[in-house]
């Protein structure tokens, strides 16, 4: 049986954990309220370092962060599987690590977007992430919270595999989205979103170049390269995917 957090003082509901936490949410549950770097060890996985964001909604694991273009995100499948970048700066945690955190549970995925005028948007989805045998398919398991869901992600129930330039799993037969755009992503038809695209500090004149950028179509449009993005995940307690 999995080791549970031991109550230290039931009157104050303080818990203690005698192993590395499984994820950021478990850290939150034992009283950790400070965001930052922690080593975690999901069931059956070696330990690894994560950024935890502690909020009123609990502990979230940061799985992606972009804000200055310091890290090249145009990488092959193995890099997206393992993870890359700097935990203090820009990074992609790694699909295998994310899957080890979520397991077979449904999860909340939060997406924070920022444009160059200081405007910000927060989106939340209920999702299920498959393992490598599904090409880490992302499935929407509930309607999207907020205004921007409709054309951003696949309809509820549809699974979209992850794609890179060297592993084309997108839903376009005539095109390799990762090759014609940039970076690895859950590409459906290439045009809805790509938060792992090329980072532009200034807007290029040529649309052909512009389409390779970081975008979220239903927020600032297909050809607006965003200034910053953060993706966070939080598994839902004891809730397996149907």
């Amino acid at each position: 049986l999995p080791e549970m957090a031991q109550p230290v003082d039931p009157a104050h509901n303080v818990s203690r954990l005698h192993r590395l936490p499984r994820d950021c949410q478990e850290l939150f549950q034992v009283g950790e309220r400070q965001s930052g770097l922690f080593e975690i060890q999901p069931q059956g996985s070696p330990p690894f370092l994560v950024n935890c964001k502690m909020t009123s909604d609990g502990g979230w694991t940061v799985i992606q962060r972009r804000h200055d273009g310091s890290v090249d995100f145009n990488r092959p499948w193995e890099a997206y599987k393992a993870g890359f970048g700097d935990p203090h700066g820009e990074f992609w945690l790694g699909l295998e690590k994310v899957h080890s955190i979520t397991g077979d549970r449904n999860s909340r995925l939060a997406v924070q977007l920022r444009d160059w005028d200081g405007n910000a948007e927060l989106l939340q989805f209920s999702v299920h992430l498959g393992g490598e045998d599904t090409a880490y398919s992302l499935q929407l398991t509930a309607p999207v919270a907020g205004q921007l869901g409709a054309t951003t992600v696949p309809p509820s129930g549809l699974s979209v595999p992850f794609s890179t330039w060297d592993q084309d799993h997108d839903l376009r037969r005539d095109k390799n989205c990762a090759k014609s755009l940039s970076g690895g992503w859950w590409f459906g038809t290439c045009s809805h979103s790509n938060l792992n695209g090329q980072y532009f500090r200034s807007i290029p004149q040529q649309r052909q170049k512009l389409k390779k950028g970081i975008f979220w179509k239903t927020w600032r449009g297909r050809y607006y390269p965003l200034q910053a993005t953060t993706m966070l995940i939080q598994p839902m307690a004891a809730e397996a995917a149907s």
Epitope: P21, L27, E32
Partner: nanobody, 126 residues
């Protein structure tokens, strides 16, 4: 100057107990409660290995499988100290024990520790 100073090591018989203590001092440790702390050990001819760690608030205390149920780590943030209570000691626990401090919230991996003490020798023998 940053300093971690271990004490409490010595010679003990199998089945016996020892309590190691580590005192942190220096400008860096004026905010001791912003560091997680850990104990590591190194036996002759072997690599340094993780023993136990404690988070900033003391609520997360991972242990190496080999010491689980026998060792207990604790900290006193008011006194800038961390202790390792070692019970039911075995000959294989013989090693130099090191105290270390990390800016990571909790960690069991050596490379995440920034500051190290000089170590204290623990010998378990009859």
């Amino acid at each position: 100057e940053v300093q971690l100073v271990e004490s409490g090591g010595g010679l003990v018989q199998p089945g016996g107990s020892l309590r190691l203590s580590c005192a942190a001092s220096g400008r860096t440790f004026s905010t001791f409660n912003t560091y997680s702390m850990g104990w590591f050990r190194q036996a002759p001819g072997k690599e340094r290995e993780f023993v136990a760690a404690i988070s900033r608030g003391g609520n997360v205390t991972p242990y190496a499988d080999s010491v689980k149920g026998r060792f207990a780590i604790s900290r006193d943030n008011a006194k800038n100290t961390v202790a390792l209570q070692m019970n039911s000691l075995k000959p294989e626990d013989t090693a130099v024990y090191y105290c270390a401090a990390s800016k990571i919230g909790i960690a069991s991996t050596i490379r995440y520790y920034d500051y190290w003490g000089q170590g204290t020798q623990v010998t378990v023998s009859s």
